[in-house]
């Protein structure tokens, strides 16, 4: 989905006397775009500018994270009079220009989305040649990446006094709910840890004390699906080790 609220930022830079009063610099981007991991998304961006019939050299840029200073993920350049914007940078080869900058369209397609792509993106256009001017979206477009749960790690670890505990870590967006099931457990939410700082899509659940041998299953679920994985605990009685 794309909400229709528009970001029309007005941070004018280096506008020269070629300007016509009819048009000002502005950029139109939706506040948010949502897509599923593994799929493609389109980040729309159109702009207006005061330089009528400008056909000189131009550069289109997209950056991630923050405006003006964030790392570039895409850049292309069009020569004077050319409709073709030649790609100079496409991070991991997944960013492709859909729009035609000559027609005031910088819209970008992002392929093979991952949860790590969930951030804010900012479009920018630069004119060179007779006119030297540039403009960048200040608020950008938030790319919201959703994903069905995936269990990234499940393990049994020793804890004090010859006991064992189990850990299950899953990722997904919305962050999945985790539940453990196993011998004498029924269904237990088992000490779910909040998503970790810098790992906003990861959730961990711990079973602090495994009291019985057998199969322990972690289930992760959100509105897009569910995933489960199991570990087995077999203690060698009379010894201090365990096979998992």
């Amino acid at each position: 989905f794309v909400r229709t609220k528009i970001d029309t930022t007005e941070n004018l830079l280096n506008t020269e006397v070629h300007s016509s009063p009819a048009q000002r610099w502005s950029m139109q981007v939706p506040p948010e775009v949502s897509a599923e991991a593994g799929d493609a998304a389109v980040l729309p961006c159109t702009f207006t500018h005061p330089h009528r019939h400008y056909d000189g050299p131009l550069t289109a840029i997209w950056r991630a994270g923050e405006p003006y200073a964030g790392p570039q993920v895409f850049r292309c350049a069009a020569a004077r009079g050319s409709e073709l914007c030649q790609t100079a940078l496409s991070l991991h080869g997944r960013f492709r220009l859909l729009g035609n900058p000559r027609r005031n369209d910088l819209s970008l397609r992002v392929e093979r989305l991952a949860l790590a792509d969930d951030r804010r993106y900012f479009c920018r256009v630069e004119f060179a040649g007779d006119v030297h001017d540039r403009y960048e979206s200040r608020h950008g477009v938030r790319l919201h990446v959703t994903a069905a749960p995936r269990i990234v790690n499940i393990s049994v670890l020793p804890s004090p006094a010859h006991a064992f505990r189990a850990l299950c870590t899953a990722e997904g967006e919305p962050p999945p709910a985790l539940a453990w099931s196993g011998p004498a457990l029924g269904n237990s939410l088992a000490a779910v840890r909040s998503p970790r700082e810098g790992h906003g899509h990861l959730v961990t659940a711990e079973l602090p004390a495994l009291t019985h041998d057998g199969r322990y299953t972690c289930t992760a679920a959100n509105s897009l699906g569910r995933s489960e994985a199991s570990v087995y605990l077999f203690r060698f009685h009379g010894a201090s080790g365990a096979s998992t």
């Epitope: 493609a40 998304a41 389109v42 980040l43 729309p44 940078l89 819209s107």
Partner: antibody
Framework: EVQILETGGGLVKPGGSLRLSCATS????????MNWVRQAPEKGLEWVAQ??????????FYAESLEGRVTISRDDSESSVYLQVSSLRAEDTAIYYC????????????WGQGVMVTVSS | DIVLTQSPALAVSLGQRATISCRAS??????????IHWYQQKPGQQPRLLIY???NLASGIPARFSGSGSGTDFTLTINPVQADDIATYFC????????TFAGGTKLELR
Amino acid sequence: EVQILETGGGLVKPGGSLRLSCATSGFNFNDYFMNWVRQAPEKGLEWVAQIRNKIYTYATFYAESLEGRVTISRDDSESSVYLQVSSLRAEDTAIYYCTRSLTGGDYFDYWGQGVMVTVSS
Amino acid sequence: DIVLTQSPALAVSLGQRATISCRASQSVTISGYSFIHWYQQKPGQQPRLLIYRASNLASGIPARFSGSGSGTDFTLTINPVQADDIATYFCQQSRKSPWTFAGGTKLELR
């Protein structure tokens, strides 16, 4: 003027292989993705393979129905693209078209005249 | 894979409007961009791009050709039809790989 010319077609026995070539001119080859699309006699069109350009790490994509039997490659210095097809079957009989696409769009803005491949014993 | 469906044939009179439809098995539109493209093919010739991304006229294509639609339903319109337009028309999607074509609609004179 954009020109695309395919060569290398002909009659091949089932199980055999062939290499199709596509020579281009009239545009900056390095700026574009290249594709092969085929059309069986009196049938529709089927996309076969795509190879992207250097900026896009020469990534390749294939139709599942042919995966493992086809390899697309390109030579930027020669402005040429190639399609290697192995383990040919009767159903691979088709006209094979070499096509160009922009880096931003997986549509085919220029097509060669095509080359006929016939698989028969 | 995304399946595209077209009716096999359409009979038209010269000077009239022809409307060729293409239906996708799932939406091919993202954020207002529709990844449907139209081609014309005459007997013994290679296909030629007419319309890209649902409604954009390709270079050198006459303005009597136009495209519209979003989501799953798309239309190629030729108005008015000329004798030179008698051909087969294909739609193609690039929303998801593999890129797929419909079977084509043969435009015939009534």
